[in-house]
């Protein structure tokens, strides 16, 4: 079963800035990934990102920069320049769709013990939903 | 895995009115925006109309514009689309989407441009 990891890191340098990580595991070759943020329990949600292998992608603030790491993982910087760990109560979704296979989504947030000086590179443990 | 089933479809007179309805789950449909695209017999896919994710903004093609109307309900994780006035060139299979087409400019729409798609449902407008 096709599944999306999904990792949440506060910056070491600028506690205003975060970096989503997210990635698919599974067959098939990705045909767009959207990345939404919201309030916990899917309250006030919105787009941040959506990513064509194509044709492109397109982001919205405070998403800063969205880019592909591999044909199956990308990543989005979001900078805030209110109050430190602007990001702390949100949580982040990607959303993977491999045509026709079908879509698959996961969510996180910053854990809550982040410590600026302990960030660590994504490491591709699922971050499942139950569906 | 994320489901979007179409429901609501069927054989209308010109100038009457259907519901589509499009079920949700397996993600936080409260959190992306949703569209409503169609294909008549024969024709490429056509956008039709779309609403952000808290329902405060909606957009149409000019076709529909005073006739369609599409909403959403988060806390039931369905999206619809009430059609008015009816006519025979709306005959086609709708289908409910994840996504907003002009997030790329598409003109050449598919599916696979969205990040998720239902199996559509067929509406028929004919006497």
């Known amino acids: 079963t096709p599944e999306v990891w999904v990792q949440v890191q506060m910056e070491a340098t600028e506690l205003s800035s975060f970096t989503v990580h997210c990635g698919f595991l599974g067959p098939g070759s990705i045909s767009l990934v959207t990345v939404s943020w919201g309030g916990p329990d899917g309250a006030g949600g919105t787009k941040l990102a959506v990513l064509h292998p194509e044709l492109g992608t397109r982001q919205w603030a405070p998403a800063r920069q969205a880019r592909w790491e591999t044909q199956s993982s990308i990543s989005l910087a979001l900078e805030d320049s209110g109050a430190s760990s602007p990001f702390a109560n949100t949580t982040f979704c990607c959303k993977f769709a491999s045509f026709p296979e079908g879509s698959w989504e996961s969510c996180g947030s910053l854990p809550p013990s982040s410590d600026p000086g302990l960030s660590a590179p994504p490491t591709p443990v699922p971050i499942l939903r139950a569906d | 895995e994320v489901q979007l089933v179409e429901s609501g479809g069927g054989l209308v007179q010109p100038g009457g009115s259907l519901r589509l309805s499009c079920a949700a789950s397996g993600f936080t449909f409260s959190y992306y925006d949703m569209s409503w695209v169609r294909q008549a017999p024969g024709k490429g896919l056509e956008w039709v109309s779309t609403?952000?994710?808290?329902?405060?903004?909606?957009s149409y093609v000019d076709s529909v514009k005073g006739r369609f109307t599409i909403s959403r309900d988060n806390s039931k994780n369905t999206l619809y689309l009430q059609m008015n006035s009816l006519r025979a060139e709306d005959t086609a299979v709708y289908y409910c989407?994840?996504?907003?087409?002009?997030?790329?400019?598409?003109?050449?729409?598919?599916?696979?441009?969205?990040?998720?798609w239902g199996q559509g449902t067929m509406v028929t407008v004919s006497s």
């Open positions: 609403i952000n994710s808290d329902g405060g903004r909606t």
């Open positions: 989407v994840e996504g907003d087409p002009h997030n790329f400019g598409l003109e050449n729409l598919s599916l696979r441009d969205f990040g998720s």
